[in-house]
Interface confidence: low
């Protein structure tokens, strides 16, 4: 190579490759006819110099054009994040259709695809049991009501509490845990003032699951003096 | 640049950089004086052509030399994995000392450091309650005994069951869930044959947590006919 050619030295930088994640709809949205379930596609680690990413959505490999894509947002680490939500039909999810998000950009070496669908397998309805506070807890100001939800499949479930018919807020659900037979269980714990329990108020554990008749069941619990 | 210069195009390859992960000791090892808690450092994605990695360990920034480093092992993808375990003093972990693993190699652009320590905050002992099977479950062949462990901090906890003094196996623990006040709770569910429950066998929920006196407590449960 002649000396005056001016060939530039190679400077190789490690490319930051964006990651794509796909998220299922919320179980409650899938099982409540008045709500709209959505599959969500999130692209992270987008460089500020990258062009906008393009989202394409497919239901059982047929392209659909009903997604809502938000403008990308800057994150604290100076990268960007882009989100696209696809409203879906309740029955499409329940019937096991596949939802595919394809993400492309001039900055990507190839499109990135992520697919999601409902867990395969025959639905099994949960058994729901309400459990009053343990006797030893009655020495405290706050007591815990427990809802034990067992033997369900798949793991997608919604557990909520009502108190005298109104939504209760001070509850926490565990993540679904798999039993040895492949079914799942969950516990939900509602903390209430002991005085509210002893006053005989009714507390209701409400469960949404696709295996249930009408996708819904509930079990109530109240203090019976003398017990 | 003249046309006949013959400058070579730049071909950049993405370097495979090793990753380092650090893992805490098991809660049971930390809280059982006859066991040895260990902090573990794992290096993955080591190329077969790379020299051995060197591990250095520091406790509160003071170098220690008691680690056991295993010979590197080949993985299925033709990369290697190297593991170093540092046996630690129970009290050092409980007192919040920082454990640092530094990994270096002639193939690395710089040493890689990972640090771990116990979750900060004042320990709070769990409240442990055992709950018999719900009455409605007694129609089934198998019933569920529940251990509710509440209001503890930090989240590191071990929950096990014994049956007439022998370790039980058919139990599952939920992952610790944070209460609104920053403490944690866990449920453990032991499935037993109804006949074993009705026979009056004693089932014991055993809990190890640093906030407990002697780091241990247990609560027993058995069927009382007529209840």
């Amino acid at each position: 190579v002649p000396r005056d050619c001016g060939c530039k030295p190679c400077i190789c930088t490690v490319p930051e490759v964006s990651s794509v994640f796909i998220f299922p709809p919320k179980p409650k949205d899938v099982l409540t006819i008045t709500l709209t379930p959505k599959v969500t596609c999130v692209v992270v680690d987008i460089s500020k110099d990258d062009p906008e990413v393009q989202f394409s959505w497919f239901v059982d490999d047929v392209e659909v054009h009903t997604a809502q894509t938000q403008p990308r947002e800057e994150q604290f680490n100076s990268t960007f994040r882009s989100v696209s939500e696809l409203p879906i039909m309740h029955q499409d999810w329940l019937n096991g259709k596949e939802f595919k998000c394809r993400v492309n950009s001039a900055a990507f070496p190839a499109p990135i695809e992520k697919t999601i669908s409902k867990t395969k397998g025959r639905p099994k309805a949960p058994q729901v049991y309400t459990i009053p506070p343990p006797k030893e807890q009655m020495a405290k100001d706050k007591v815990s009501l427990t809802c034990m939800i067992t033997d369900f499949f798949p793991e997608d479930i919604t557990v909520e509490w009502q108190w005298n018919g109104q939504p209760a807020e001070n509850y926490k659900n565990t993540q679904p845990i798999m039993n040895t037979n492949g079914s799942y269980f969950v516990y939900s714990k509602l903390n209430v003032q002991k005085s509210n329990w002893e006053a005989g108020n009714t507390f209701t554990c409400s469960v949404l699951h696709e295996g249930l008749h009408n996708h819904h069941t509930e079990k109530s619990l109240s203090h019976s003096p003398g017990k | 640049v003249p046309r006949d210069c013959g400058c070579k195009p730049c071909i950049c390859t993405v370097p495979e950089v090793s990753s380092v992960f650090i893992f805490p000791p098991k809660p049971k090892d930390v809280l059982t004086i006859t066991l040895t808690p260990k902090v573990t450092c794992v290096v993955v994605d080591i190329s077969k052509d790379d020299p051995e990695v060197q591990f250095s360990w520091f406790v509160d920034d003071v170098e220690v030399h008691t680690a056991q480093t295993q010979p590197r092992e080949e993985q299925f993808n033709s990369t290697f994995r190297s593991v170093s375990e540092l046996p630690i003093m129970h009290q050092d972990w409980l007192n919040g000392k920082e454990f640092k693993c530094r990994v270096n190699s002639a193939a690395f652009p710089a040493p890689i450091e990972k640090t771990i320590s116990k979750t900060k905050g004042r320990p709070k002992a769990p409240q442990v309650y055992t709950i018999p099977p719900p009455k409605e479950q007694m129609a089934k062949d198998k019933v569920s005994l529940t251990c509710m462990i509440t209001d503890f901090f930090p989240e590191d906890i071990t929950v096990e069951w014994q049956w007439n003094g022998q370790p039980a196996e058919n139990y599952k623990n939920t992952q610790p869930i944070m209460n609104t006040n920053g403490s944690y709770f866990v449920y453990s569910k032991l499935n037993v044959q109804k006949s074993n429950w009705e026979a009056g066998n004693t089932f014991t929920c055993s809990v190890l947590h640093e906030g407990l006196h002697n780091h241990h407590t247990e609560k027993s449960l058995s069927h009382s006919p007529g209840k």
Epitope: E155, I177 | F21, P24, D29, V83, T158, N173
Partner: nanobody, 125 residues
Framework: QVQLVESGGGLVQPGGSLRLSCVVS????????IGWFRQAPGKEREAVSC????????NYADSVKGRFTISRDNAKSTAYLQMNSLEPEDTAVYYC??????????????????WGQGTQVTVSS
């Protein structure tokens, strides 16, 4: 959402071998324990083997001990089940499952909450 995809199933003669693979995507594999489960026609799903996130501990069902070997390669986001000395009773759909690593010391493959769609293994002459 973590996704798992199994491969490597097929038809094999008794005494033969197969190696199943499970590719995990949508999450950091190092954060999960991996289990292999199987379901034979008309039977309940059963655990076959599992391995902790750092490959340090493994568990096997009694029926496969000494014949099956579980392993994982976090760098490749892949878990494996090497099945040797296969028997007709091993015929089933084999599922891979991921569980978040649990620091409780006595449970080596707890609480799977992500599943693959399964791969068929048939052992027949």
């Amino acid at each position: 959402q973590v996704q798992l995809v199994e491969s490597g199933g097929g038809l094999v003669q008794p005494g033969g071998s197969l190696r199943l693979s499970c590719v995990v995507s949508g999450g950091t594999m190092n954060a999960y324990a991996i289990g292999w489960f199987r379901q034979a026609p008309g039977k309940e799903r059963e655990a076959v083997s599992c391995i902790t996130s750092n490959s340090k501990y493994t568990n096997y069902a009694d029926s496969v001990k000494g014949r099956f070997t579980i392993s994982r390669d976090n760098a490749k986001s892949t878990a494996y089940l090497q099945m040797n000395s296969l028997e007709p009773e091993d015929t089933a759909v084999y599922y891979c499952a991921a569980a978040q690593f649990f620091n409780d010391g006595h449970q080596y493959c707890p609480n799977p909450n992500y599943w693959g769609q399964g791969t068929q293994v048939t052992v027949s002459s």
